[in-house]
Interface confidence: low
């Protein structure tokens, strides 16, 4: 599984090289699942993608997401996941030219086809949580995270640090 240890490896690499800028530091292909081991899957329908949160049978192939890691150009005032006060951010792309976007107006997580440079809505601050889990905080709306609401992904506001470990905003990254 690609959890805290994997992220920390890249965090150390960031610290060593002090890379900044708009190019990704590294890219990683992983399957994304919820804290409760439901898979996040993507299906092409009428030239746009649907996002599903569902139980997969053991023999069903998990969808992979390309995570591109960036170091924030602006120092973070908060300690925790940053490197020397800088934040680690990711974009998530399940297929060529499509990226997860935060639609803060609709409180939804959407897939949009777009060209680089990507808009801020496609960037998420990566938080290392417990039990090899990560969470994704909207760059455009601090305190709002990608989460699972019923059977779909949504944007969920986390109003206190104690709620950072609520299961519905925790995700697992896995190489398998």
């Amino acid at each position: 599984a690609f959890g805290i240890s994997g992220v920390q490896k890249y965090t150390r690499a960031l610290h060593d090289s002090s890379i900044t800028g708009i190019s990704p530091i590294t890219e990683y292909l992983a399957s994304l699942s919820t804290y409760n081991d439901q898979s996040i899957t993507f299906a092409l329908e009428d030239e746009s993608y649907e996002i599903y949160v569902e139980d997969l049978k053991k023999d069903e192939k998990k969808d992979k997401v390309l995570l591109s890691y960036y170091e924030s150009q602006h120092p973070s005032n908060e300690s925790g996941d940053g490197v020397d006060g800088k934040m680690l951010m990711v974009t998530l792309s399940p297929t060529k030219d499509f990226w997860l976007h935060a639609n803060n107006k609709e409180h939804s997580v959407e897939l949009h086809k777009c060209e680089k440079p990507l808009p801020d809505q496609a960037f998420f601050v990566l938080h290392n949580m417990h039990s090899n889990c990560v969470s994704f905080e909207c760059k455009t709306d601090p305190g709002v995270f990608i989460g699972v609401k019923d059977n779909h992904l949504a944007l969920i506001k986390v109003d206190s640090s104690e709620n950072l470990c609520t299961e519905n905003i925790l995700f697992k990254l896995s190489e398998t």
Partner: antibody
Framework: EVQLVQSGAEVKKPGASVKVSCKAS????????IQWVRQAPGQGLEWMGE????????YYSEKFKGRVTMTTDTSTSTAYMELRSLRSDDTAVYYC????????????????WGQGTLVTVSS | DIQLTQSPSSVSASVGDRVTITCSAT?????MHWHQQKPGKAPKLLIY???NLASGVPSRFSGSGSGTDYTLTISSLQPEDFATYYC????????FGGGTKVEIK
Amino acid sequence: EVQLVQSGAEVKKPGASVKVSCKASGFNFKNYWIQWVRQAPGQGLEWMGEIFPGTGTSYYSEKFKGRVTMTTDTSTSTAYMELRSLRSDDTAVYYCARKHRGYGYGGAWIAYWGQGTLVTVSS
Amino acid sequence: DIQLTQSPSSVSASVGDRVTITCSATSSVSSMHWHQQKPGKAPKLLIYRTSNLASGVPSRFSGSGSGTDYTLTISSLQPEDFATYYCSGGYSHPTFGGGTKVEIK
């Protein structure tokens, strides 16, 4: 085969309440949004609200908030819609329906409909 | 909330005619869906995501459009196609157009 079978026609007096049931089969009831849509005689379709049986999460149209309650019984795969303080203009066919499983932008379409329940409100 | 306006509200046509129904949204939607309703029956999904035919729907039905303007076309009207057609769109929940009644001329 996906099926939504609704309860029979009802006649109610103004001020009364009605509770319409919708029994689902052919799919995992817990995993799909159930919609309630009504249609007054000779009129178009009007969305009332929806409920996700897996968690009981519900959303209601502003027009019906405070007057409608949607519930589910996952043990029997049945959805219920109760409308209170009935008026004559609530006379309509009430449909339960099931959304397509997808969610994401533009994923709100209804894929299956119940046969409808006629509710007549008359003194 | 998004409002959907269908036109025409009714159309008289003959078997074999080409019929076009339009649906206009007050703001851009990513796709449109269409339902068919026959008298005394429940609606039935006809087209989803703008142009995809629902299971069992004949190929004479087609859908197109983007942004705020969408179209349902019946290329050659058949006797069983006389019905009312509703467009449906929206993000968080379905919104319906006012309906278009296709009648026999």
